[in-house]
């Protein structure tokens, strides 16, 4: 059974991930973002189901494309370079889902824009955090 300290650590990691995803979304939605139209053409794949930490595998598999989209945006829209930002997210995701369990992600049939994708994972983080508090 998870201890209170491990639950707290998980909660903090999720909050960190949530903030990173919200920061990216805010940077993309910035009215000064000239690349938004092109960014919205990138197709992102959504999980069929995202209710547990193991489902973060589906997010991890989309972080490569996410980095490429962020490379299009002006760097001043974000506090960090896309490579560093994604690297930070990868570390958090890996700690949350674990590196040993090889969960096979199942994707929904419909693809999403980067905005829909980020909103989905922001909702996921908020949902898990709410169950921990």
């Amino acid at each position: 059974a998870p201890t209170s300290s491990s639950t707290k650590k998980t909660q903090l990691q999720l909050e960190h991930l949530l903030l990173d995803l919200q920061m990216i979304l805010n940077g993309i939605n910035n009215y000064k973002n000239p690349k938004l139209t092109r960014m919205l053409t990138f197709k992102f794949y959504m999980p069929k189901k995202a209710t547990e930490l193991k489902h973060l595998q589906c997010l991890e598999e989309e972080l490569g494309p996410l980095e490429e989209v962020l490379n299009l945006a002006q760097s001043k829209n974000f506090h960090l370079r896309p490579r560093d930002l994604i690297s930070n997210i990868r570390v958090i995701v890996l700690e949350l889902k674990g590196s040993e369990t090889t969960f096979m992600c199942e994707y929904a049939d419909e693809t999403a824009t980067i905005v829909e994708f980020l909103n989905r994972w922001i909702t996921f983080c908020q949902s898990i955090i709410s169950t921990l508090t």
């Epitope: 990138f42 794949y45 595998q57 991890e60 490569g64 494309p65 490429e68 890996l94 994707y107």
Partner: antibody, heavy 123, light 107 residues
Amino acid sequence: QVQLVQSGAEVKKPGATVKISCKVSGDTITAYYMHWVRQAPGQGLEWIGRIDPDDDSTKYAENFKGRVTITADTSTDTAYMELSSLRSEDTAVYYCTTITFLYSRELRWFAYWGQGTLVTVSS
Amino acid sequence: DIVLTQSPATLSLSPGERATLSCQASQYIGNYLSWYQQKPGQAPRLLIYSATSLASGIPARFSGSRSGTDFTLTISSLEPEDFAVYYCLQHYSTPYTFGQGTKLEIK
């Protein structure tokens, strides 16, 4: 169906520069990140770098920085790879290949390849 | 840079046999790994992407699996046209790197 057609074989002297082309047909080049990979005779595959033809941003492998320039001409849907200060170790088959994030997950990998261009560096 | 180590360097088998090719990453790369087949004088061909997904037009006898940083390409029953060189490739971070290849030859 997307096809990549590369320019013909080249023979160059050490110190010279070579420029190889890769024409995309079946789609617009701006839908793809154009990558270049090389293979020395009897050896494995080595990633050189890539270009996003939509905004001309490039990424290069450290080994090639300063010697390689990847460009793209969106009016002709053609990508180019120029390698300077050639030496005998650059003798290889050079391939162009693609990645896109606009279509299926499969096409996020090197799904389409050119036929390869043999570059021979010899004095 | 991420190093991919393929083994064995050469695999000698007969048609109808099962082939198991290995690719080990020097660090965690998730599922950011693909497998390619290359025949003499030809460009590589995508077989497996995202570690386990079969590329379109590739026969079902090819499959990919992953355990941590160890990746496996399995050919369930070898056909004569399967004898070639196989490479793994990681897309986790640039520079993208390939394994050194496994030559699958007829015994």
